[in-house]
């Protein structure tokens, strides 16, 4: 609906009530340290109720946490940015007017991040096909708390051979994360030729370890167009 603000009829007095319990179902919030957390208590009533917040049953004051917190009355929400372990506890919204009071309690657990090697989303990058002269994108979704280094690598041939004297394959780094590289998780290939066909590897490393996944590019002759589905979903299946 275009207009979603409901003004209470001044004669219809009403104690506070929850207007969107769906937003309140998740009572336990386990949040990684440094993330933002938001608790909501959407309510109505007439006169319009006020909202206050308690932490562990006591009035929650701005000075109780470094950086304070934000309350958006129009959203009926409490927002804490960059949570730390000392933010753990029970948070209760108390919504009241002269006709009554209701409350709801959330439990916040702040999870300290344990470093791990990068995790790559399964199925990405995905195999792709395009015609000669076409464009294609490979996407590699990376999950890493520690700063990840992303490389896009392709097997290449040297003097007609795919392998060097040491038996290792010849590899070419096509793109890597760094100052001059925007959105390293995406490798875009434009105006492809048959020589671009082959295996493309997304290799991601951080100080703990590394992970890699690969996809194949098939380059078709101009007259043999690939299916639409593959082209326009850009491998987010």
């Amino acid at each position: 609906m275009a207009e979603d603000f409901v003004s209470e009829n001044s004669n219809n007095k009403r104690a506070p009530y929850w207007t969107n319990t769906e937003k309140m179902e998740k009572r336990l919030h386990a949040v990684p340290a440094a993330n933002t957390v938001k608790f909501r208590c959407p309510a109505g009533g007439n006169p319009m109720p006020t909202m206050r917040w308690l932490k562990n049953g006591k009035e929650f004051k701005q000075e109780h946490r470094i950086g304070g917190y934000k309350v958006r009355n129009q959203h009926w929400s409490l927002i804490m940015e960059s949570v730390v372990p000392s933010d753990k506890g029970n948070y209760t919204c108390v919504v009241e007017n002269e006709y009554g009071s209701i409350n709801h309690t959330y439990h916040l657990d702040v999870v300290e991040r344990s470093p791990h090697r990068p995790i790559l989303q399964a199925g990405l990058p995905a195999n792709a096909s395009t015609v000669v002269g076409g464009d294609v994108e490979f996407v590699c979704k990376v999950y890493s708390d520690a700063q990840p280094h992303i490389q896009w690598i392709k097997h290449v041939e040297k003097n007609g051979s795919k392998y060097g004297p040491d038996g290792l394959p010849y590899l070419k780094v096509l793109k890597h994360s760094g100052i001059n590289s925007s959105n390293a998780e995406v490798l875009a290939l434009f105006n492809v030729t048959e020589a671009d066909a082959g295996e493309y590897i997304c290799k991601v490393s951080n100080y703990i370890g590394q992970a890699n996944q690969s996809a194949w590019l098939t380059v078709l002759p101009k007259q043999q167009a690939p299916g639409r589905e593959k082209e326009h979903h850009h491998h987010h299946h």
Epitope: D4, T19, N35, T36, K70, Q74, H75, I79, E81
Partner: antibody
Amino acid sequence: QVQLLESGGGLVQPGGSLRLSCAASGFTFSDYAMSWVRQAPGKGLEWVSTIEGDSNYIEYADSVKGRFTISRDNSKNTLYLQMNSLRAEDTAVYYCARERTYSSAFDYWGQGTLVTVSS
Amino acid sequence: DIQMTQSPSSLSASVGDRVTITCRASQDISSDLNWYQQKPGKAPKLLIYDASNLQSGVPSRFSGSGSGTDFTLTISSLQPEDFATYYCHQWYSTLYTFGQGTKVEIK
């Protein structure tokens, strides 16, 4: 119908000031949070600032904090953005936008006003 | 700040195609995500709010899904008037952020 009309844009030198206005009509202005969003030439959208209907909640993007001030006059149905210490990177089209109630989706936008910071 | 990463940055498609644009948040943002369409020289237009709700007056070929960190905008059958740039926008944090945009061009 809901209408938002920005004004006050123009050419200003680095270090200078400008005050943008957004005249609102077609809805109960004081019931809604309002925001400023900007777009540098050829670039994407960047949120600048938000103010709730009663002015009790105000927030700014880090890039403008301490230089820009958002305010509103509910009796005049007008939103303001006072911009001081302007920089070249503040050059953009500035849009005012209304937030849906109970949400922060910008459901109505003005046509935008261009601010150019250049010597 | 919460970073929003949109992909692809651009795509070429034909009228009638099904188009999918994704947006990923750097942390859980529940369903506090909106999608906008913008045409050159015009103000953005709200398409989807709270991840999956269709804004009044927006054609039903537009749909949104997702929650947490991964979100999708789908155009089921691309129309000529749909060639534009699309942005996602999170409001979970008090510091709102937009994705960098996805330009949908005519093939």
